[in-house]
């Protein structure tokens, strides 16, 4: 697994640098999981043929993903620092079902899929602590997620592989576009 | 392999509006990740940046001259255009659209078209 | 807006000389800043990404550093071929900024 954000050989050669701030350590933390859900890609597309498939023909899934829309505030054409910043919150916790979904689905990359998973629930915590309004962050339904998590290992092993694409694809267009938010507040 | 390539009107009127189209080959503008923007350089002036479009629809324009110009994308026509209204004089420069690609945007032109001149 | 300022504006240069441009963001900007050259009557070219990362059939005499908000472009033995303008680009956010250039000229 990578070095977790702040423990990169970089940072030991450099013992004066000045401390990460929380924008800039929210920015490291994206860019390490980034980096895990790239690794876990790999895998999957050398298992199996899907990464080839078009957008379109992946389109026609039944799992609601979090993606970002311009209603959520973090595009440049109404952008609301807040509004984006609950939303983005909400979207992380949404794909934490599907997180762990990926738990057991990869033969070498296991350590990785658990690392993306961890680093995930520090992520949200460093932007809790940025929030201001914690109350207009809704949490999922555990037993919605458990009945969700039955269903999605209860698939047969094309739609499972099927689904593990779409789910790295779609959290990595959601953490691309929150990293690039996060930067304009 | 990647390449752009700006087209458009050489000469405009004062007051008239300005239509750039750069067509792309060698990548989609629907992968996560990718953009692409427009730069201007005056002669013998430096760079300056225009605006921006990404994969998902997400439009960035230069703050001085946002009232003037829309940027959108054609996605299955491996277009963008650049529409800038009210021309001026002072708008005389190199137009150039680039590409950006990579997981952390890093916002980087790792390619430039050859530019087309506007005067 | 974060504005680049690059230094010198203009570096009178001997090949094989070993030289150093300066680019200073009005802000700290991480490790989102990028190099490019411009030879005269040519598209700008990406030079260096995100500081030091080196860029494919990019020689590597052309080396970065930094971090912050202060960075440097270093050519470790000037060829002929050198000579043009180099720009830094702020790449954390927008609007994108460019320094005015520094102009490499031989002597």
């Known amino acids: 697994a990578p070095v977790p954000p702040g423990e990169d050989s970089k940072d030991v050669a450099a013992p004066h640098r000045q401390p990460l701030t929380s924008s800039e350590r929210i920015d490291k933390q994206i860019r390490y999981i980034l980096d895990g859900i790239s690794a876990l890609r790999k895998e999957t597309c050398n298992k199996s043929n899907m990464c080839e498939s078009s957008k379109e023909a992946l389109a026609e899934n039944n799992l609601n993903l979090p993606k970002m829309a311009e209603k959520d505030g973090c595009f440049q054409s109404g952008f609301n620092e807040e509004t984006c910043l609950v939303k983005i919150i909400t979207g992380l916790l949404e794909f934490e079902v599907y997180l762990e979904y990926l738990q057991n689905r990869f033969e070498s990359s296991e350590e990785q899929a658990r690392a993306v998973q961890m680093s995930t629930k520090v992520l949200i915590q460093f932007l809790q602590k940025k929030a201001k309004n914690l109350d207009a962050i809704t949490t999922p339904d555990p037993t919605t997620n458990a009945s969700l998590l039955t269903k999605l290992q209860a698939q047969n092993q094309w739609l499972q592989d099927m689904t593990t694409h779409l789910i790295l694809r779609s959290f990595k267009e959601f953490l691309q576009s929150s990293l690039r938010a996060l930067r304009q507040m | 392999q990647v390449t752009l390539k700006e087209s458009g009107p050489t000469l405009v009127k004062p007051t008239q509006t300005l239509t750039l189209t750069c067509s792309f080959s060698?990548?989609?503008?629907?992968?996560?990740?990718?953009?692409v923007g427009w730069v201007r350089q005056p002669p013998g002036k430096a760079l300056e940046w225009l605006a921006f479009?990404?994969?998902?629809?997400?439009?960035y324009y230069s703050p001085s001259l946002e009232s003037r110009l829309t940027i959108t994308k054609d996605t299955s026509k491996n277009q963008v255009v650049l529409t800038m209204t009210n021309m001026d004089p002072v708008d005389t420069a190199t137009y150039y659209c680039?590409?950006?690609?990579?997981?952390?945007?890093?916002?980087?032109?790792?390619?430039w078209g050859q530019g087309t001149l506007v005067t | 807006d974060i504005v680049m300022t690059q230094s010198p504006a203009t570096l009178s240069v001997t090949p094989g000389d070993r030289v150093s441009l300066s680019c200073r963001a009005s802000q700290s900007i991480s490790d989102y800043l990028h190099w490019y050259q411009q030879k005269s009557h040519e598209s700008p070219r990406l030079l260096i990404k995100s500081v030091s990362q080196s860029i494919s059939g990019i020689p590597s005499r052309f080396s970065g550093s930094g971090s912050g908000s202060d960075f440097t472009l270093s050519i470790n033995s000037v060829e002929p071929e050198d000579v043009g303008v180099y720009y830094c680009?702020?790449?954390?956010?927008?609007?994108?900024?460019f320094g005015a250039g520094t102009k490499l000229e031989l002597k």
């Open positions: 060698g990548f989609s503008l629907s992968t996560s990740g990718v953009g």
């Open positions: 680039a590409r950006s690609y990579d997981d952390y945007l890093y916002y980087a032109l790792d390619y």
């Open positions: 680009q702020n790449g954390h956010s927008f609007p994108l900024t």
């Open positions: 479009i990404f994969w998902d629809d997400d439009k």
